[in-house]
């Protein structure tokens, strides 16, 4: 159980004050108006690996 607002969220997630919880930025596609999505816009998702050299 995370103390409110203390630990930073892992990459690809952002803090929701509304839910008192780190939330997965991927869910912003379905719910773009969630409060944590602003933090997702500021921190782009982890880079993907190319499948070829």
């Amino acid at each position: 159980e995370q103390a409110p607002g203390t630990a930073p969220c892992s990459r690809g997630s952002s803090w929701s004050a509304d839910l008192d919880k780190c939330m997965d930025c991927a869910s912003c596609r379905a719910r773009p108006h969630s409060d944590f999505c602003l933090g997702c816009a500021a921190a782009p998702p982890a880079p993907f690996r190319l499948l070829w050299p």
Epitope: E1, A17, D18, L19, R31, H33, S34, D35
Partner: antibody, heavy 123, light 111 residues
Framework: QVSLKESGPGILQPSQTLSLTCSFS??????????VSWIRQPSGKGLEWLAH???????RYNPSLKSRLTISKDTSRNQVFLKITSVDTADTATYYC???????????????WGQGTSVTVSA | DIVLTQSPASLAVSLGQRATISCRAS??????????MHWYQQKPGQPPKLLIK???NLESGVPARFSGSGSGTDFILNIHPVEEEDAATYYC?????????FGGGTKLEIK
């Protein structure tokens, strides 16, 4: 259609442990963003939020009661539980469970509530 | 904890007139983009019913005579025109931080 229903012992004695069950239908607690809260209301008085459990089993408690509260869930049975230890007459109230769930605009406040279960603590 | 103070504690409004209920928070429940304030209606023997979420967004099925406004520490619930079925107790609630707290309630009587 979403519905929630609370059940409890009705009457119990001081120092005992209160066990409450919230049985729900119409949504799944395995859905990302979903959660269930417990709220209580002494007769003729206001509302007090007690605890919340999330789809991923993360839990939150009201600090003023945290040492006495335990919230848990059985996702497969669509049930959420609350235990309050060492009850006193001040715990006499109607206890509600309520859902917080995701929608397009973000996350609902408590949008669906059960009818409540009355609990009396009396010697 | 954020304390929510509602005023008045009770009010009587004539049918068809405007009811205004205030909710003041002990500290801001808003950010630059969000106001985490919600309003509920409770009738005797019933659970609370969500009316307005995030300050001004009407819950589905709630009549348009209900409206909410405000930011920071000061919020308002307006009902206009008031109807008989609006007789109830109204509560504000915030979700800005834990613990989520409710106002003490405002009892609305229809004259």
């Amino acid at each position: 259609q979403v519905s929630l229903k609370e059940s409890g012992p009705g009457i119990l004695q001081p120092s005992q442990t209160l066990s409450l069950t919230c049985s729900f239908s119409g949504f799944s607690l395995s859905t990302s963003g979903m959660g269930v809260s417990w709220i209580r209301q002494p007769s003729g008085k206001g509302l007090e939020w007690l605890a919340h459990i999330y789809w991923d089993d993360d839990k939150r408690y009201n600090p003023s009661l945290k040492s006495r509260l335990t919230i848990s869930k059985d996702t497969s049975r669509n049930q959420v539980f609350l235990k309050i230890t060492s009850v006193d007459t001040a715990d006499t109230a109607t206890y509600y469970c309520a859902r917080r769930g995701p929608d397009y605009y973000g996350y609902y406040p408590m949008d669906y509530w059960g009818q409540g279960t009355s609990v009396t603590v009396s010697a | 904890d954020i304390v929510l103070t509602q005023s008045p504690a009770s009010l009587a409004v004539s049918l068809g007139q405007r009811a205004t209920i205030s909710c003041r928070a002990s500290k801001s429940v808003s950010t630059s983009s969000y106001s985490y304030m919600h309003w509920y209606q409770q009738k005797p023997g019933q659970p609370p019913k969500l009316l307005i979420k995030y300050t001004s967004n009407l819950e589905s099925g709630v009549p348009a005579r209900f409206s909410g406004s405000g930011s920071g520490t000061d919020f308002i619930l307006n009902i206009h025109p008031v109807e008989e079925e609006d007789a109830a107790t109204y509560y504000c609630q915030h979700s800005r931080e834990l613990p989520w707290t409710f106002g003490g309630g405002t009892k609305l009587e229809i004259k």
